[in-house]
């Protein structure tokens, strides 16, 4: 052999995000010659499950039928062929929300806001919790984190936005989390529509005030501005 | 109609144990929402007991003064909440409340409340 | 902790008078307070949430204001149903609090 097996592809339908108690089926495809797929779980005992390929023998199912905290977290898989078991797939990370009640999201100063101005969006919880996660509808990387350092828990995380040009607008939920699992998250907050007026041929905003470069609505820069407000909490771009 | 109604409340004696249970009807206890316990005793003010979430993992916060002789439950199958409480004293007598915390954070929805007496 | 501190404990008034309770909170609550009116007997009935924000069917001579630590609940024109106990409540829920309600105002016939 010339060399290693080629790594298997890891999927899940109808997708990673999943809210508690739906279903869910993790798909592990592989090779023709597969006898067999092994599904591992980060931290459980592996392996996690196996099953046997479907017909045409490249892939498996694993099914998942009511969602809860046990099944979320990062999956590998792995196939047998005749020649042995296949290098691991790229992770997998299975994420379950309805863990906690929905935060709140507001917009500061209004969710009204002219092309070029500054606005923050507020995600806030009643009772603490280390991560705040913002997100936008249809967005290509909507996934933005405020994490808390040490332990130190939250009641709210702002995201600032600015300038702001008409990328920014759309429909914004936000999520929070504990700390003992990044894959468990609240219920999504009630949507918040941020409505940009303003010339439609707004300039990109420049990336060289960002704290942090990464992408954000749209693969535009999101540009959260100054520094965090709450000095617990850390910035970070997923 | 949206309500929640407490019951188990009674007589018990000094050391004794008790449990309330909060029947939620109208909607449902897994739904986004937290639940309070609440406490008034003859003549006084409102004292909060502790809260338990509605989210799946069912996180619990209690009152500093509870120092574990009170536990908050659920069992959403019967869309019910409980409150387990030991080890009772006189002045744990009071009227029980549940109530719901809104999406504006307030307590938009209270039980009619049920009376704990705990004498010899 | 947040301690609630709500003054006067009992206020004495007519029919017709214009009543203001204060509710002070011991660090910022943002605008996460309820106003709660209670009668004899009766369970709490949420006013005024977020606040200023008036329940759904709370007369309208009811008011809330304030934000951070100081907040105000003002009656416009004391009616005969209004005698009452007023307790204010922050929003915020964890294992640091000793309560989240204020005292508690009595509003009685002067």
């Known amino acids: 052999q010339a060399g290693p097996l080629p790594k298997p592809t890891l999927w899940a339908e109808p997708g990673s995000v999943i809210s508690w108690g739906n279903s869910v089926t993790i798909w592990c495809q592989g090779t023709l010659e597969a006898r067999e797929y092994r599904l591992d779980k980060e931290e459980s005992p592996a392996p996690w499950d196996r099953q046997n390929p479907l017909e045409p023998k490249n892939k498996a199912r694993f099914s998942i039928p009511s969602m809860t905290e046990d099944y979320a977290g990062r999956y590998r898989c792995y196939y047998r062929s005749p020649v042995g078991w296949s290098q691991p797939s790229d992770p997998l990370e299975l994420v379950m929300t309805g863990a906690y009640s929905k935060p709140t999201l507001s917009a500061l100063p209004s969710p009204l806001v002219t092309s070029g101005k500054s606005v923050t969006l507020l995600c806030q919880s009643r009772s603490p919790m280390d991560t705040f996660l913002l997100i936008k509808e249809r967005a290509a990387h909507p996934l933005l984190h405020l994490r808390s350092e040490h332990g130190a828990q939250q009641h709210q995380a702002e995201f600032p936005m600015s300038p702001v040009t008409s990328v920014h607008g759309g429909t914004y939920r936000c999520f929070s989390s504990h700390g003992f699992s990044h894959y468990l998250l609240s219920h999504p907050s009630d949507p918040l529509e941020l409505i940009v007026s303003g010339s439609l041929e707004d300039p990109r905003p420049s990336p060289t005030r960002s704290v942090s470069t990464a992408a954000g609505p749209e693969d535009q820069p999101l540009m959260p501005t100054g520094s965090v407000p709450h000095s617990g909490l850390r910035r970070h771009w997923e | 109609e949206v309500q929640l109604v407490e019951s188990g409340g009674g007589l018990v004696q000094p050391g004794g144990s008790l449990r309330l249970s909060c029947a939620a009807s109208g909607f449902s206890l897994s739904s986004s929402y937290w639940i309070s316990w609440v406490r008034q005793a003859p003549g006084k003010g409102l004292e909060w007991i502790g809260s338990i979430d509605s989210g799946s993992v069912g996180i619990t916060y209690y009152a500093t003064w509870v120092k574990g002789r009170f536990t908050i439950s659920r069992d959403n199958s019967k869309n019910t909440l409980y409150l387990q409480m030991n080890s009772l004293r006189a002045e744990d007598t009071a009227v029980y409340y549940c109530?719901?915390?809104?999406?504006?954070?307030?307590?938009?929805?209270w039980g009619q409340g049920t009376l704990v007496t705990v004498s010899s | 902790d947040i301690q609630m501190t709500q003054s006067p404990s009992t206020l004495s008034a007519s029919v017709g008078d214009r009543v203001t309770i204060t509710c002070r909170a011991s660090q910022s609550i943002v605008s996460w307070l309820a106003w709660y009116q209670q009668k004899p007997g009766k369970a709490p009935k949420l006013l005024i949430y977020k606040a200023s924000t008036l329940a759904s069917g709370v007369p309208s001579r009811f008011s809330g204001s304030g934000s951070g630590t100081e907040f105000t609940l003002t009656i416009s024109s004391l009616q005969p149903d209004d005698f009452a106990t007023y307790y204010c409540q922050h929003g915020y829920i964890r294992g640091d609090l000793d309560n989240v309600f204020g005292g508690g105002t009595k509003v009685e016939i002067k």
């Open positions: 109530a719901r915390h809104g999406d504006n954070w307030a307590l938009d929805l």
